[in-house]
């Protein structure tokens, strides 16, 4: 807290300009009018203030707007945003995408801070859903943003927004998140032709069910091993050797290097050894010839 002292003669600020750089903390407190600061916030970021000086300016704005800053001030906070706490931000009502962009720009290149997370949360809640423009903006600044959301939060993403998602945006998503995103992607890209559709849907396939993988295997897609390894194990297990061969195309040879890893390992255990042998890859661990496979889950369902 800065002590209340009288402003020295001739030092009263008539405008927010660079001469304030050399004001001490108590001089800023005494000589800068809060209302003047609020109307000229756009100038603050162009002036190389120290963090100590920004603390004083924040204190002045807090006194002027105890219920939270108006958006006209928020949009021009610039580096002053770095001094805000999540509690401060929860008082704001940010509706403009331009305001969001301006504040994210200040934090650019840094990890997502609690302040930024709170700001995004306030903004998205205010909009009611993650629309395409917002998602575009957020993933541009934070490629991992989408994967930081819970499946419940992801459910508010409209399919139209999926067009904004780049493959790297999904790198850290877990299967539960992809389960939510995949149906949206399928809907978003449904009018594309085979090869184009596969390029777009590929990053989301970690949420695809067996029947969709079977359908893809009929389309000569040549899925790479990296994508195959991210598929849901329960979706891969029912695929036949022939279907996997068609799905992977020339990449089928890569199965040998992955035979000890899921989902390949578990899939091998479910296949007949003589079917695996047709691939000519030396895959071992399939069901020996002559053995009968009982599907107990079907048995339970019937009884």
């Amino acid at each position: 807290e800065v002590e209340k002292t009288a402003c020295p003669s001739g030092k009263k600020a008539r405008e927010i300009d660079e001469s304030l750089i050399f004001y001490k903390k108590w001089e800023l407190e005494a000589c800068v009018d809060a209302a003047l600061l609020a109307t000229q916030m756009d100038r603050v970021n162009a002036i190389p203030f120290t963090y100590e000086q920004l603390d004083v300016l924040k204190h002045k704005l807090d006194e002027l707007y105890p219920q939270g800053y108006p958006e006209s001030v928020i949009q021009h906070l610039g580096y002053l945003f770095l001094k805000m706490s999540p509690e401060d931000i929860r008082k704001w009502n940010v509706t403009s995408l331009e305001t969001l962009k301006a504040l994210l720009e200040v934090n650019k290149g840094h990890e997502m801070s609690p302040q930024v997370a709170t700001l995004i949360d306030r903004f998205v809640k205010g909009r009611g859903q993650l629309d395409k423009d917002t998602l575009d903006t957020l993933t541009a600044f934070y490629p991992g943003y989408l994967c930081s959301l819970s499946p419940e939060e992801l459910s508010s993403v409209p399919p139209s927004s999926i067009w904004a998602v780049r493959p790297q945006d999904l790198d850290t998503c877990d299967p539960r998140q992809l389960d939510v995103l995949y149906p949206k992607a399928r809907l978003a890209f449904q009018n594309m032709n085979g090869s184009e559709y596969f390029v777009k849907i590929q990053s989301f396939l970690g949420g695809a069910p067996t029947e969709d993988l079977k359908a893809l295997s009929q389309q000569n897609v040549s899925m790479d091993l990296a994508t195959f390894m991210k598929l849901r194990t329960d979706a891969v297990l029912p695929l036949t050797v022939a279907e996997v061969q068609k799905l992977l195309g020339p990449h089928v040879e890569g199965l040998k290097a992955e035979e000890r890893h899921r989902p390949v390992r578990d899939w091998i255990l479910r296949q007949r050894q003589d079917d695996l042998d047709t691939l000519g890859l030396g895959l071992q661990g399939g069901i020996p010839n002559g053995y009968l496979v009982l599907d107990l889950s079907m048995q339970e369902a019937l009884s």
Partner: nanobody, 128 residues
């Protein structure tokens, strides 16, 4: 890379004047605070003058107020220190310093840590 080169130092009699120059290369000068520091033998560096990016604001400690004047010419990428009424205690190596970092500083402008680029220094000796 930014380079700051000082010139104009030398030997001067008490009461005399000198004009120091600092030439900056490698980056535009228009958005940064510039300062002049000095370091007398066996002492730490002290700020003797600082100037705002566009030159509208200046700072001087009491020890040089009224005798020293800092100015800048951003078009020429130059910063100057006009020193009048020189005294023996003004004898020191004078350094030009600049802060180019765009984000707010943790240090205050009169401390060395505020500045991120320094010149090699020029010797000023005041003696009869």
């Amino acid at each position: 890379e930014v380079q700051l080169v000082e010139s104009g130092g030398g030997l001067v009699q008490p009461g005399g004047s000198l004009r120091l120059s600092c030439a900056a290369s490698g980056r535009t000068l228009s958005s940064n605070v510039m300062g002049w520091f000095r370091q007398a033998p066996g002492k730490g560096r002290e700020l003797v003058a600082a100037i705002t990016p566009r030159g509208s604001g200046t700072y001087y400690p009491d020890s040089v107020e009224g005798r020293f004047t800092i100015s800048r010419d951003n078009a020429k990428r130059m910063v100057y220190l006009q020193m009048n009424s020189l005294r023996a205690e003004d004898t020191a190596v004078y350094y030009c310093a600049a802060r180019f970092a765009p984000d707010p500083a943790f240090s205050v402008y009169w401390s060395e840590n505020y500045y991120d680029y320094w010149g090699q220094g020029t010797q000023v000796t005041v003696s009869s």
